[in-house]
Interface confidence: medium
């Protein structure tokens, strides 16, 4: 089951997601998507990182912490009721079926 997080309309929502890089600066690609984690990748991608930096993001969706140290927590700014739902944080570890997948449920009130 998904871990549940709450936020109020008009406030910022915080969805935590962390991993430990194998070595400083040795990053693993990460994607955030709206909807539960599928078998591969993320559906409805809202933000993505590569081995070096954030390479895709959409309005209101930002990385909240120091992603170069493995904090890939997501901030959704100024949320509305439409932002409710499941979000997928996927740590795309190299190799077959090695990905770490986290489904987080956001409840807006």
């Amino acid at each position: 089951s998904e871990v549940e997080y709450r936020a109020e309309v008009g406030q910022n929502a915080y969805l935590p997601c962390f991993y430990t890089p194998a070595a400083p600066g040795n990053l693993v690609p990460v994607c955030w998507g709206k909807g539960a984690c599928p078998v591969f990748e993320c559906g409805n991608v809202v933000l993505r990182t590569d081995e070096r930096d954030v390479n895709y993001w959409t309005s209101r969706y930002w990385l909240n912490g120091d992603f170069r140290k493995g904090d890939v927590s997501l901030t959704i700014e100024n949320v509305t009721l439409a932002d409710s739902g499941i979000y997928c944080c996927r740590i795309q570890i190299p190799g077959i079926m090695n990905d770490e997948k986290f489904n987080l449920k956001l409840v807006i009130k």
Epitope: G25, T49, D53, V54, W57, W62, D66, K69, E77
Partner: antibody, heavy 122, light 108 residues
Framework: EVQLLESGGGLVQPGGSLRLSCAAS????????MSWVRQAPGKCLEWVSA????????YYADSVKGRFTISRDNSKNTLYLQMNSLRAEDTAVYYC???????????????WGRGTLVTVSS | QTVLTQPPSVSVAPGKTASISCGGD??????VHWYQQKPGQAPVLVIY???DRPSGIPQRFSGSNSGNTATLTIHRVEAGDEADYYC???????????FGCGTKLTVL
């Protein structure tokens, strides 16, 4: 080419007000967190305030909280700093700086303006 | 709140290697960024995320960060490298950006 141009500095008496502006060009302004950083004559750099790309979230150094207000007009590609109840210790060159992309807090300051001098003196 | 400690000054002969330290409690757990500032000019980013170099910054500039110390290293120092160098981190506990008080690099 990214450009940041500050204006609005000058001489003001203690207790007075000033509004600084920073005109930005060469990038999608609303996609980036922006900050103000100041440097008193011969002193260190001091972060003053920051604002998220949408303008929905703001942050202030303790030394200016309650006196300064940061804002932005994304339709005009302009960042502002409203400074009230100015003190002698606010005398400094004020720089606007652009944060790194895709990050809520900006994390590092990739581009800087040339600065505008604010002098608070009677 | 984290405090960043830099030596006030470092002197080095041309062609040699300069190392500028930035100390802070468990600074290795944070990303450190470095800026160069020449007299009368705005700061310029020279290293970000501990060791990455922006385009246009010579390969002679490098950075490292571990434990309680981050280090900016300038190899084959040139006269034009003479400047103040500042380290910077984002303190997530306070959501404040912190700068060290700068190190003046003098090229002898």
């Amino acid at each position: 080419e990214v450009q940041l141009l500050e204006s609005g500095g000058g001489l003001v008496q203690p207790g007075g007000s000033l509004r600084l502006s920073c005109a930005a060009s060469g990038f999608t302004f609303s996609s980036y967190a922006m900050s103000w950083v100041r440097q008193a004559p011969g002193k260190c750099l001091e972060w003053v305030s920051a604002i998220s790309g949408s303008g929905g979230s703001t942050y202030y150094a303790d030394s200016v909280k309650g006196r300064f207000t940061i804002s932005r007009d994304n339709s005009k590609n302009t960042l502002y700093l409203q400074m009230n109840s100015l003190r002698a210790e606010d005398t400094a060159v004020y720089y606007c700086a652009r944060g790194s992309y895709g990050t809520y807090y900006g994390n590092y300051f990739e581009y800087w303006g040339r600065g505008t001098l604010v002098t608070v003196s009677s | 709140q984290t405090v960043l400690t830099q030596p006030p000054s470092v002197s080095v002969a041309p062609g040699k290697t300069a190392s500028i330290s930035c100390g802070g409690d468990n600074i290795g757990g944070k990303s450190v960024h470095w800026y160069q500032q020449k007299p009368g000019q705005a700061p310029v980013l020279v290293i970000y995320y501990d060791s990455d170099r922006p385009s246009g910054i010579p390969q002679r500039f490098s950075g490292s960060n571990s434990g309680n110390t981050a280090t900016l290293t300038i190899h084959r120092v040139e006269a034009g490298d003479e400047a103040d160098y500042y380290c910077q981190v984002l303190d997530r506990r306070s959501d404040h950006w912190l700068f060290g008080c700068g190190t003046k690099l003098t090229v002898l």
